[in-house]
Interface confidence: low
């Protein structure tokens, strides 16, 4: 299709080399067309071209995005050759920064509803460059946290070094919707609620003698509770002794609750004490089994292929730790009475003999 009739917009992404950040392009189609395409289409199923793999017109992605190669080659679709670029409705999301994102991006309606729509397209010329570190040491992050229930603010990273008085007029979007209430370089939130979480975009215009550019930055805002003041607590095992059958497999589960921490580095491990020896056990990875705003429950299992006599003399210890402190829970194994016949006992003794040899050759003192 002919792109010479597309409206043109110039954008600048000055990314920080110190942090991960995203970028978003909006398909700013002229208003009458936009209302068609950025909401559910009202076309009947019979009007859907048969090459589109959707059974229902409401499932159609509303706009199609292309990238224009600088060498004049034909337009490229944003394909899986750009795995870091995601299309969603009327937006194009860049997951990683880099000058290789520089280029021209064109969007147009996926479906043409009237002859006037044929020329309905937008060309966005995107320039991407690293922000000079010298320009501002304390620029706002592209990931900002708001403490639930308190007052907070969201700053536009590209303008956070300027005072409110110096700041140009800023246009803010939240999750793709225009926020018309504020035009300054930061949004002040009187009381933070969960719904303040989301993807914020701030735009301002920068002009030079030749042309004007929209400078854009994207901020991921998360609403959080305050960091915990408690060390983790172990929910399971509760009992310090566990009845077991010799020669049978056994799984002991350790579950612990970790309070929210902005920088979360939970530690959860199993170790075994045997007389004066102590060593950490190689066990399956810990997994998060429940995660809420306030805390996270993490589980890690220790698996014994067969319980031996030696295991009855050992102590199994679950150790958990966060930045506040650590907690442990010890478990002693106790043989179930009347659980096995002579064969079981002989088998268990045989296993124990093999394990003793393995133990002596493989285990060392825990430091």
């Amino acid at each position: 299709f002919n792109i010479s009739g597309c409206s043109t917009k110039k954008l600048l992404w000055a990314y920080s080399t110190r942090s991960e950040e995203e970028f978003i392009l909006f398909c700013d189609l002229p208003e009458p067309q936009k209302s068609h395409f950025c909401h559910r289409s009202q076309l009947s199923p019979t009007q859907v071209p048969d090459h589109l793999p959707f059974t229902d017109s409401k499932d159609l992605p509303d706009v199609q995005w292309y990238r224009q190669p600088s060498n004049g080659d034909p337009l490229e679709d944003i394909r899986k050759s750009y795995p870091h670029i995601i299309q969603d409705k009327c937006t194009l999301r860049f997951l990683t920064p880099g000058v290789n994102n520089t280029g021209s991006y064109i969007c147009r309606p996926k479906m043409i509803k009237s002859p006037y729509d044929v020329a309905c397209c937008v060309k966005m010329i995107l320039e991407v460059k690293p922000q000079s570190n010298a320009s501002c040491e304390n620029s706002a992050s592209h990931k900002q946290d708001l403490l639930l229930g308190s007052t907070g603010s969201i700053s536009c990273p590209s303008l956070s070094c300027q005072s409110d008085a110096q700041s140009p007029e800023v246009t803010w979007y939240k999750n793709g919707k225009l926020l018309s209430m504020t035009r300054s370089n930061r949004i002040v939130v009187d009381e933070v609620y969960i719904y303040h979480q989301g993807t914020y975009v701030c735009d301002y215009t920068q002009s030079d003698t030749a042309s004007s550019w929209t400078v854009r930055a994207v901020v991921q805002v998360r609403t959080i509770v305050g960091d915990t003041k408690l060390k983790p607590d172990i929910l399971d095992p509760v009992e310090s002794t566990l009845e077991v059958e010799l020669g049978k497999p056994l799984t002991i589960s350790c579950k612990a609750r970790f309070g929210f921490e902005r920088v979360f580095n939970p530690v959860m491990k199993w170790y075994i004490k045997d007389a004066d020896l102590e060593w950490e056990v190689s066990v399956p990875e810990a997994k998060s089994i429940k995660s809420t705003l306030k805390d996270e429950i993490i589980e890690r299992n220790i698996i014994l292929e067969k319980v031996t006599q030696r295991d009855l003399r050992r102590t199994f210890v679950c150790f958990v730790q966060n930045s506040i402190g650590n907690t442990t829970q010890s478990v002693q194994l106790k043989e179930k009475r009347g659980s096995g016949g002579l064969n079981d006992i002989f088998e268990a003794q045989k296993i124990e003999w093999h394990e003793t040899v393995r133990f002596q050759s493989h285990h060392h003192h825990h430091h």
Epitope: H51, D59, W65, R79, I86
Partner: antibody, heavy 124, light 107 residues
Framework: QVQLQQSGPGLVKPSETLSLTCTVS????????WSWIRQPPGKGLEWIGY???????NYNPSLKSRVTISVDTSKNQFSLKLSSVTAADTAVYYC??????????????????WGQGTTVTVSS | AIQLTQSPSSLSASVGDRVTITCRAS??????LAWYQQKPGKAPKLLIY???SLESGVPSRFSGSGSGTDFTLTISSLQPEDFATYYC?????????FGQGTRLEIK
């Protein structure tokens, strides 16, 4: 990296509703399509349907009248309900993430991350 | 619905062999085809998408080709871990459909 954890009962009685949930960890449920696929014992794979995080769905016509797929973005999970089950619905059920590939005239989706699978037996 | 027919249904080969599996679509699907590998008791794993693009992390001995109705998956030099069942999948039109599978066994 993104991981999918499936949960739900392994045994369902005939004529009842099969319910499974898939929890996304290590990434957000947003901006992706999420599918359910099943595999009867010793047989091939059958696509059941997908849901976009916004709630848009598309189902296999062969199952459409009995299937509901829903999403809960706050919990980072999506669910499958299959009503009026019979023995023919006995299968391993998988959830998967669909990665979109936009081609010149079309949108394609391939499943690049899968759940571990849940064996569901329909029996009284 | 578009039907995909894989051949052969099963295949015996040795480590080091070159193996080719074909997938034929009941109507043209452009390049909208993917290949998956499935091992017993495990979920399928994406190998190839868009008929010939190798998924990241997949060894380069796997390759795909074809367009329209005829597609092939080639393993240039079989490794012990390659013995599994392979499925083709079309995503040109809904409903998404899979081939019946090709079981690759050790000779």
């Amino acid at each position: 990296q993104v991981q999918l954890q499936q949960s739900g009962p392994g045994l369902v009685k005939p004529s009842e509703t099969l319910s499974l949930t898939c929890t996304v960890s290590g990434g957000s449920i947003n901006n992706y399509y999420w599918s359910w696929i099943r595999q009867p014992p010793g047989k091939g794979l059958e696509w059941i349907g997908y849901i976009f995080y916004s709630g848009t769905t598309n189902y296999n016509p062969s199952l459409k009248s009995r299937v509901t797929i829903s999403v809960d973005t706050s919990k980072n999970q999506f669910s499958l309900k299959l009503s009026s089950v019979t023995a023919a619905d006995t299968a391993v059920y998988y959830c998967a993430r669909d990665v979109g590939i936009a081609a010149r005239n079309s949108y394609y989706y391939v499943m690049d991350v899968w759940g571990q699978g849940t064996t569901v037996t329909v029996s009284s | 619905a578009i039907q995909l027919t894989q051949s052969p249904s099963s295949l015996s080969a040795s480590v080091g062999d070159r193996v080719t599996i074909t997938c034929r679509a009941s109507q043209g699907i452009s390049s909208a085809l993917a290949w998956y590998q499935q091992k017993p008791g495990k979920a399928p794993k994406l190998l190839i998408y868009d008929a010939s693009s190798l998924e990241s992390g997949v060894p380069s001995r796997f390759s795909g080709s074809g367009s329209g109705t005829d597609f092939t998956l080639t393993i240039s030099s079989l490794q012990p871990e390659d013995f599994a069942t392979y499925y083709c999948q079309q995503f040109n039109s809904y409903p998404i459909t899979f081939g019946q599978g090709t079981r690759l066994e050790i000779k």
